[in-house]
């Protein structure tokens, strides 16, 4: 029952798994559009390089009969079902694009002899780290933990003069797929984040979170959570917050902060938002399709996945090398290729590198402003605003452990 790869004699195909369960609730038509847009670009690039070949995508749709929740948590078998479909059809492309759910990817990796490259727009969990033929085009949890540890340790910036070694993590289990795995990585006792902290406690109930905001006996001033401002508001409301509390809101795939008319709501003043730069190249890109700010990154990852496939195809064909080899399957890492928004760098393990951006709310203008950026490729924090207009005392981030002298918190009666 050998599956033949449609991957030679001038015809090269990428198999795209179109799953009902995906990391983001993006209509499959948008994903298909992104793939097709990517194919157009790839064809142009190959033609410009003098390579007269055919490149196509075959879309493999899940029938949704067994798995109809549309939720990644129930997706363990869906990827395997799709692989069975491929197996029955005895037809497979050079590369597999998808799945995006961590459980599916992990299970497929476990249960199959993957001798071809797999590209995922997702698979955020630590369990998908260090997989030899897996490439991930959206920041995995490992990259987040590296940023947080780096930022916690930083103590030589004008606005952060204390190293931190403690944290609360709010995780109530209703999070989106990306947040679920990001918080999972922070919670895991074996993770880098846990290893580097002297105190960490996971808050699982709304009330636990709400109580900490004004608790004189709290063990840390820092709370990490994941979601958008609305998610925070539902939890925090207009409750009073002790003046030395810092909430780190992880919201990587949301470009809404970078819309010109956005004003930060008042409840965001104690919050630092960790998000991703919406393209940090001087050359403006024009990703023109009508996508919401939160969905753009997911569709873009599919598009970039196709461009990566094209890049590898071009490289191997120009060198006269065979595509259906273990060498090709293991080559989708430690490289930079021309993505839709500019260069995209993959690390030694095939995970995308990015520029993360930490935003704060200016008390003067009520606008979001960039505090610092972080380059995941070199694990380096670059301060941008040396004199931020913070809500915190002296416009500096507080220590993570409050001096237990006389209390100066503003009580709310």
């Amino acid at each position: 029952s050998q599956v033949s790869q449609n991957c030679h004699n001038g015809s090269y195909e990428i198999s795209v798994l179109m799953m009902d369960n995906s990391a983001f609730a993006e209509p499959l038509e948008n994903v298909e559009d992104a793939v097709n847009e990517g194919l157009e670009i790839v064809r142009g690039r190959l033609q410009n390089a003098g390579l007269n070949v055919t490149v196509n995508a075959s879309f493999m749709y899940s029938d949704g009969l067994i798995h109809n929740s549309g939720d990644c948590r129930s997706s363990t078998c869906e990827g395997l079902d799709l692989l069975r479909k491929i197996s029955n059809a005895k037809r497979m492309g050079c590369v597999l694009m998808g799945p995006s759910c961590t459980y599916s990817t992990f299970q497929m990796y476990l249960d199959t002899e993957l001798s071809y490259p797999m590209i995922s727009a997702g698979s955020f969990g630590l369990s998908c780290d260090y997989k030899e033929t897996l490439t991930r085009l959206m920041s995995p949890a490992r990259k987040l933990t590296y940023f947080l540890v780096n930022f916690w340790k930083t103590n030589d910036l004008p606005f952060k003069t204390y190293s931190w070694s403690t944290s609360y993590v709010y995780k109530n289990g209703t999070e989106s797929e990306d947040c679920f795995w990001y918080l999972n990585a922070l919670e895991a006792s074996v993770s880098y984040f846990s290893h580097e902290l002297s105190f960490k406690l996971v808050l699982r109930q709304d009330k636990e979170f709400q109580d900490i905001l004004m608790d004189h006996n709290r063990k840390s001033n820092v709370i990490v959570m994941c979601g958008d401002p609305e998610f925070l508001y539902k939890l925090k409301g207009d409750r009073a917050v002790a003046e030395d509390i810092v909430i780190i809101l992880v919201d990587l795939f949301n470009d809404q902060y970078f819309e010109d008319n956005v004003t930060a709501p008042d409840y965001m003043k104690n919050v630092l938002v960790l998000t991703q730069s919406p393209g940090n190249s001087l050359l403006n890109s024009s990703f023109s399709r009508n996508l919401s700010p939160t969905k753009r990154d997911f569709a873009l990852a599919y598009l970039n996945g196709i461009l990566l496939f094209g890049h590898m195809l071009k490289t191997f064909l120009e060198n006269g090398e065979n595509i259906t080899t273990p060498k090709f399957a293991h080559a989708f890492r430690n490289l930079t290729f021309e993505g839709y928004d500019g260069p995209v760098t993959l690390d030694d393990w095939g995970d995308v590198d990015s520029t993360m951006v930490l935003l704060y709310t200016s008390v003067d203008t009520k606008k979001y402003k960039v505090l610092l950026t972080y380059d995941t490729h070199v694990n380096q924090t670059n301060p941008v605003d040396m004199s931020p207009t913070f809500t915190w005392k002296n416009s500096k981030l507080p220590n993570d452990i409050t001096d237990r002298g006389p209390q100066h918190h503003h009580h709310h009666h």
């Epitope: 970078f258 819309e259 010109d260 730069s277 919406p278 940090n280 001087l282 403006n284 951006v357 200016s362 203008t365 606008k367 979001y368 402003k369 960039v370 505090l371 950026t373 670059n382 941008v384 605003d385």
Partner: nanobody
């Protein structure tokens, strides 16, 4: 009156670092996008980095990962930190400013320019 004054240029060995400053006056940094440009001998002027008024840095591919930009509003000054310098970074570096129409995008052109500061990378 808007003014921009660059400083910090000089001679540095390949692999070395320099920090350029751009002291500004006559406007509020929060309302302006600032760009660093450079012009090598016999070549056209090219954009190096822009910092949008919201504080988002945007880089030319040739300097990404080596150069960083920051600003200190309390001193009305911008800084360009240049690491791992190469011979091809040799140029006159200019600071430019433009009233921001967008908080997160770089302007297509700049209204105000400094006089420039020379950076020479050579062993």
């Amino acid at each position: 009156e808007v003014q921009l004054v660059e400083s910090g240029g000089g001679l540095v060995q390949p692999g070395g670092s320099l920090r350029l400053s751009c002291a500004t006056s006559g406007f509020t940094l929060d309302d302006y996008a600032i760009g660093w440009f450079r012009q090598a001998p016999g070549k056209e002027r090219e954009g190096v980095i822009c910092l949008t008024s919201g504080g988002l840095p945007k880089y030319a591919d040739s300097v990404k990962g080596r150069f960083t930009i920051s600003r200190d509003n309390s001193k009305n000054t911008l800084y360009l930190q240049m690491n791992s310098l190469r011979a091809e970074d040799t140029a006159v570096y200019y600071c430019a400013a433009s009233g921001a129409t967008s908080r997160w995008n770089c302007p297509p052109q700049y209204d105000h320019w400094g006089q420039g500061t020379m950076v020479t990378v050579s062993s």
